[in-house]
């Protein structure tokens, strides 16, 4: 990974020396906590017959408030620590009179990184010591000499997962415009293991490295209005704590059973993705649990296979997107990748090939927004606590923060007419820039229909008339009838269904007998009543992979990795009529509801989830007794 | 608020023997699996016996059988591990555990005692 001659892996490079641009005379005191990387910084490199200026701002959302990182000290424990004085040399912007560029550096010791001009994607890296005015590669990433890698996720594992794959669903957007929605934030804690730690050699050198890869990941995601935060890093210097198999469908079913034990004690995150030196089998240098995003098996592994950091960028980017529910590229009629044949592929595309691509394509970017409509996507919404972002508020980085009323990213990327970019204030005579109920910059009035209900265990929104955001997605109450069991927070979970999910189209629950089992560690069962709950136990199908099985007659219980606990039938599944497993017994339906909520509606709406009323168009909660025109008017703040 | 407290550990020479005590508090466990694990540094946590909440029904690791058992008194709320024929690879801190629900994963953890076997 860092050999001592780095250009020795390049066929062909450019040698430059990068020429920093003095910064502008007049500039805003900054916080001392900011430290000895500038806020903002230019350069000036000559590549390819041209003079590319980049002009950089440091990522200060790359790093989540709590962002911890844990590593075994010498003693021999396990250290978990939030570092203090976070500031960090890591950057991104565009170059110069290239309205569709972007760039994403680190300058801790010379540049590091890629810039992209048009469809060409340029990787510069120092070639010595000289910092960032010696001489450094610039080079495209074909130049790079490495095999091909390929994702392990296969065809026939996302076909019953994604649904009919036809041209149909993709009617493409016009390139340079962000998805209207809100931006959706992923909260990733990455664990690097041994054999990377090994290779890099130090802590130091393995939290660079990562950082550079997430501000990459960030970099290519926000085309997609996502950002990337890393709120936590895991290093394993001393010894790995799962068993990382050159199998990489063994060491993410590991990574997910660790993950699943590790949960309570370590960071509540959206995603969890391992970075290891590990060769996987083959050509794989990827593998990801799809559409698992914000579920217990959000996450992938990913093998660092290429000198250059942008290449795990590139592969972390891509399985997050199976994790988000995007399908390859090369799977969908009429998907159409905007990128220039020659230069390489997009993203999802099945194999790199020989350069790292830069963007995602059309039919991604369909997959995403149809995953975006699920329930299970909500984990997305949630913004890293704005108040502790790293650095402070900073207009231009798509977090819409104190002191500011939208935030459409720098100016060079902003699409948005009705957001002044340059000081994040609302144009003038704008109500609003962001939000599903924000159209041609007015708050669309209220009753209006934002968010359609997506199956029986949903409820329908309306924009109220005074806010561009949608309510938040509200689902029917609790124990209302679906599809063979009864909804819980917006699913209709089935024992039929979870042994699908575990086991494949041909799992289904195992006989009722095998209920009356609870398992022991080393597979041993001790009788219990026989109440549906506890223990999943299911037949059929197929074992999934890396999970090790107890069987005791006819029933099939998933153990964890290291087979001390077995995988839980999960709340809310339907165990009997009318009735439901909570806290691990079969009870009956009213533990859902403590109170009569339907009847304070008013007969204008519907108690939810979290037995509130859910509105019906028009009127106003918290118990629909009054239409909300009523109410606004009464305030003074019809818009 | 839920609590795992483990007490009895110590040092002791190897032959001898040693009884941890588990209490837990803040809600009733009788139905779930209860357990003990060990850790020394730089090693993963290691399953050393558990008990169900129904039949009593006891399950250890290779290890340990025969020389460790566990037990359980409902109407205390607690879970004891005697441990007879101490070896210096006992040597560990030791952690009772709870299932949340019963077939769940053990969220419920203590604190840790110390074991500590010479030779």
């Known amino acids: 990974i860092a050999p001592s001659r780095p250009w020795a892996l390049m066929e062909q490079y450019e040698v430059v020396l990068p020429w920093r641009l003095p910064g502008p005379r007049v500039r805003r005191a900054l916080p001392s906590h900011l430290g000895l990387h500038p806020e903002r910084v230019s350069y000036v490199l000559g590549a390819t017959g041209h003079n590319f200026t980049l002009h950089l701002r440091k990522n200060r959302d790359l790093l989540g408030s709590g962002y911890t990182e844990t590593y075994t000290a010498a003693n021999g424990s396990e250290v978990t620590e939030q570092p203090r004085g976070q500031d960090h040399c890591f950057y991104q912007g565009h170059v110069e009179g290239y309205p569709d560029s972007a760039a994403s550096l680190s300058t801790c010791a010379g540049l590091r990184g890629f810039f992209q001009v048009g469809s060409d994607l340029h990787l510069i890296e120092p070639l010595d010591e000289g910092g960032e005015g010696g001489r450094h590669a610039v080079y495209q990433a074909e130049h790079l000499l490495q095999t091909a890698g390929t994702c392990g996720v296969s065809d026939d594992s996302l076909g019953s997962l994604l649904g009919p794959r036809t041209a149909a669903v993709f009617r493409p957007r016009p390139g340079d415009s962000l998805p209207s929605r809100e931006t959706r934030y992923v909260e990733l804690y990455v664990v690097v293991d041994n054999a990377e730690f090994q290779m890099l050699g130090s802590e130091a050198a393995v939290r660079h490295r990562v950082l550079e890869v997430v501000n990459h990941v960030d970099k290519l995601y926000q085309k997609l209005n996502f950002r990337v935060v890393l709120v936590g890093l895991e290093i394993w210097n001393s010894q790995d704590r799962f068993h990382v198999s050159p199998d990489p469908s063994v060491t993410l079913e590991n990574l997910l059973t660790w993950q699943a034990r590790q949960r309570t004690r370590r960071h509540l995150h959206d995603n969890v993705q391992l970075i290891t030196g590990v060769d996987f089998t083959g050509t794989t240098v990827g593998f990801a649990r799809v559409s698992a995003m914000c579920s217990h098996s959000s996450g992938a592994v990913n093998q660092d296979h290429s000198k250059n950091p942008v290449g795990v960028a590139c592969t972390m980017a891509h399985e997050m997107g199976h994790n988000l529910g995007m399908d390859h590229d090369e799977n969908v009629q009429g998907c159409r990748c905007q990128e220039r044949f020659e230069a390489g592929r997009c993203i999802m595309a099945g194999s790199i090939g020989s350069s790292f691509p830069r963007m995602f394509s059309d039919c991604s970017q369909a997959y995403l927004e149809s995953f975006l409509e699920r329930p299970q996507s909500v984990c997305l919404a949630n913004a890293p606590d704005l108040s502790h972002l790293v650095g402070g508020p900073v207009c231009g980085n798509l977090f819409v923060e104190r002191g500011e009323q939208c935030d459409c990213g720098p100016p060079e990327d902003c699409r948005n007419r009705c957001c002044n970019s340059t000081t994040c204030q609302l144009a003038e005579g704008a109500q609003c820039a962001h939000g599903t109920c924000c159209q041609e910059c007015k708050v669309k009035p209220a009753g209006e229909l934002c968010r359609p209900k997506k199956d029986m265990c949903d409820l329908e929104e309306f924009c109220d008339g005074r806010h561009p955001e949608c309510p938040e997605d509200a689902f029917q109450e609790n124990g209302t009838p679906c599809s063979g069991g009864y909804c819980y927070n917006g699913a209709c979970p089935t024992l039929a269904q979870q042994c699908q999910a575990f086991w494949g189209p041909g799992g289904q629950a195992a006989e009722e007998s095998c209920f009356s089992y609870d398992i022991l560690p080393g597979c041993k069962a001790s009788r219990y009543r026989a109440d549906m709950c506890g223990v999943l136990q299911c037949k059929g199908g197929q074992q999934p992979l890396g999970r090790a099985i107890c069987i005791v007659d006819v029933c099939h219980a998933l153990t964890t990795e290291d087979g001390t606990a077995y995988e839980p039938v999960p709340e809310g599944t339907r165990c009997g009529p009318e009735k439901v497993c909570w806290k691990g017994r079969c009870q009956d339906l009213h533990v859902y509801r403590s109170s009569n909520c339907s009847a304070q509606c008013h007969n204008h709406g519907v108690c939810n989830h979290k037995q509130e009323c859910h509105c019906h168009a028009g009127w106003a909660p918290p118990h629909c007794a009054k239409l909300l025109t009523e109410v606004h008017a009464a305030s003074g703040s019809l818009p | 608020e839920v609590q795992l407290v483990e007490s009895g550990g110590g040092l002791v020479q190897a032959g001898g023997s040693l009884r941890l005590s588990c209490a837990a508090s803040?809600?009733?466990?009788?139905?779930?699996?209860m357990g003990w694990f060990r850790q020394t540094p730089g090693m993963k946590r290691e399953f050393v016996a558990a008990i169900s909440g129904s039949e009593n029904v006891t399950s250890y690791a290779d290890s340990v059988k025969g020389r460790f058992t566990i037990s359980r008194d409902n109407a205390k709320n607690t879970v004891t591990l005697q441990m007879n024929s101490l070896k210096p690879e006992d040597t560990a801190v030791y952690y009772c555990?709870?299932?949340?629900?019963?077939?769940?994963?053990?969220?419920?953890w203590g604190q840790g005692t110390q074991v500590t076997v010479s030779s």
């Open positions: 803040g809600r009733t466990f009788s139905e779930v699996v």
């Open positions: 555990a709870a299932q949340r629900w019963r077939g769940g994963s053990y969220e419920y």
